[in-house]
């Protein structure tokens, strides 16, 4: 015996491979004060959740780790929260609040998820000129990824000298310290996702003046 | 209104039963999972069992797990606890409540003495 | 089993005084803490359940606050009314416990 609900908002939600989505969810304000459950999505068609808060059930190997169910009942949200979103994820889920003691459950209503291809790509900065033998710090970053995505991996490919700096979710420092012919040869930054199996770079042509 | 209301209690001697009732009424009671709580004189509440809505799933404190037995029976909105192998400590007054813990019985009292 | 631990175990405070009870739990139990007040005879009531929800019809002056494994329940002008005995209890996961309970007296 099942209670139904409407999810607000759109029906569909688009996310690139590789980044983060939520799917917002709001318990409905018909909930009684003693009807405490645990939450689960699933995904449409699937007997096994995708995330949940019971201590007590599996999730999908598929999504474990990545799908996550942001409880809070007090503030009546139920949302779900997907980081490294993968093509098989594109799907529609539904949530499910249910307990065992009571005989019955509330379901939303269900909302499209679709995952696109990774437009994104890495951008890299340089600060003013590069000078012959001067080092400079060149900067890539990927501003999109959300924070609490798998960190990318950064790789950069340069003829000239280089070192690596210092970096963070977002973003990756490459001291180089260009000869003269290094000048018009090309510098990459390559990101990958670890957590959907996606790489993107960018690469630039270096200008070096000489001193 | 929402009510319930506890039945059975007495005076009873070590090792004997008791058969604790508890009538519903004012909601839905086959919708419900249903608890039993208790609090000895002078003491704090101690939860007891807890029972489903349909009778599927029950589960007891350990002090009280293999004597006591949680039911109900929701063609009669009654819920029930069987007390077997009753002890001196198990004297205190029994509530039930619905799952929420949100209604409550006034509680019927249990001593057991010699 | 989580236990819970409630302090302090008594408090004596005057009518108007702001009265703060904390339950702490063995591991966490996310929001799904209900707080209790009962009075001598008579059965317990509930007045906050999932941690910070006020029950229907119970005054504005008992809140709840906390997550995870910290609680705490507030009565921010104590009334001659409020006089009992506070009972923390969880409901993340069997067995459904209950602190020891505080009791708020008369000073």
């Known amino acids: 015996q099942e209670r139904r609900f409407q999810l607000e908002g759109p029906e569909s939600l688009t996310v690139q491979e590789g980044l983060c989505v939520l799917v917002p969810c709001r318990l409905p304000t018909t909930l009684p004060a003693s009807y405490y459950g645990y939450g689960y999505w699933f995904l449409e068609g699937a007997d096994v959740p995708v995330a949940t808060n019971d201590p007590d059930e599996e999730v999908q190997e598929e999504t474990r780790g990545r799908f996550h169910l942001l409880w809070d009942p007090r503030r009546k949200n139920c949302s779900l929260s997907i980081r490294d979103a993968r093509r098989r994820d594109n799907a529609a889920y539904f949530f499910r609040l249910k307990s065992k003691w009571m005989k019955y459950g509330y379901t939303s209503s269900k909302l499209s998820v679709r995952v696109m291809a990774l437009t994104h790509r890495p951008n890299i900065s340089i600060p003013g000129t590069l000078e012959s033998g001067h080092p400079s710090n060149l900067t890539c970053s990927v501003p999109w990824v959300c924070e609490q995505g798998t960190p990318p991996i950064f790789s950069w490919m340069s003829a000239a000298p280089t070192s690596l700096g210092p970096r963070t979710t977002q973003s990756s420092v490459l001291t180089i310290t260009p000869r003269p012919q290094d000048h018009s040869t090309n510098l990459t930054c390559q990101v990958t996702f670890p957590g959907a199996g996606v790489t993107m770079e960018r690469t630039i042509q270096l200008n070096v003046s000489y001193a | 209104e929402v009510q319930l209301v506890e039945s059975g209690g007495g005076l009873v001697q070590p090792g004997r039963s008791l058969r604790l009732s508890c009538a519903a009424s004012?909601?839905?009671?086959?919708?419900?999972?249903m608890h039993w709580v208790r609090q000895a004189p002078g003491k704090g509440l101690e939860w007891v069992a807890v029972i489903s809505y349909d009778g599927s799933n029950k589960y007891y404190a350990d002090s009280v797990k293999g004597r006591f037995t949680i039911s109900r029976d929701n063609s009669k909105n009654t819920l029930y606890l069987q007390m077997n192998s009753l002890r001196a400590e198990d004297t205190a007054v029994y509530y039930c409540?619905?799952?929420?813990?949100?209604?409550w019985g006034k509680g019927t009292t249990v001593t057991v003495s010699s | 089993a989580i236990r819970l631990t409630q302090s302090p175990s008594s408090l004596s405070a005057s009518v108007g005084d702001r009265v703060t009870i904390t339950c702490r739990a063995s591991?966490?139990?996310?929001?799904?803490l209900n707080w209790y007040q009962q009075k001598p005879g008579k059965a317990p009531k509930l007045l906050i359940y999932a941690a910070s929800s006020l029950q229907s019809g119970v005054p504005s002056r008992f809140s709840g606050s906390g997550s995870g494994t910290d609680f705490t329940l507030t009565i921010s002008s104590l009334q001659p009314e409020d006089f009992a005995t506070y009972y923390c209890q969880q409901s993340y996961g069997t067995p459904f416990t209950f602190g020891p309970g505080t009791k708020v007296d008369i000073k």
């Open positions: 591991q966490s139990i996310s929001s799904y």
């Open positions: 409540a619905n799952y929420g813990m949100d209604v």
């Open positions: 004012g909601f839905t009671f086959s919708s419900y999972g």
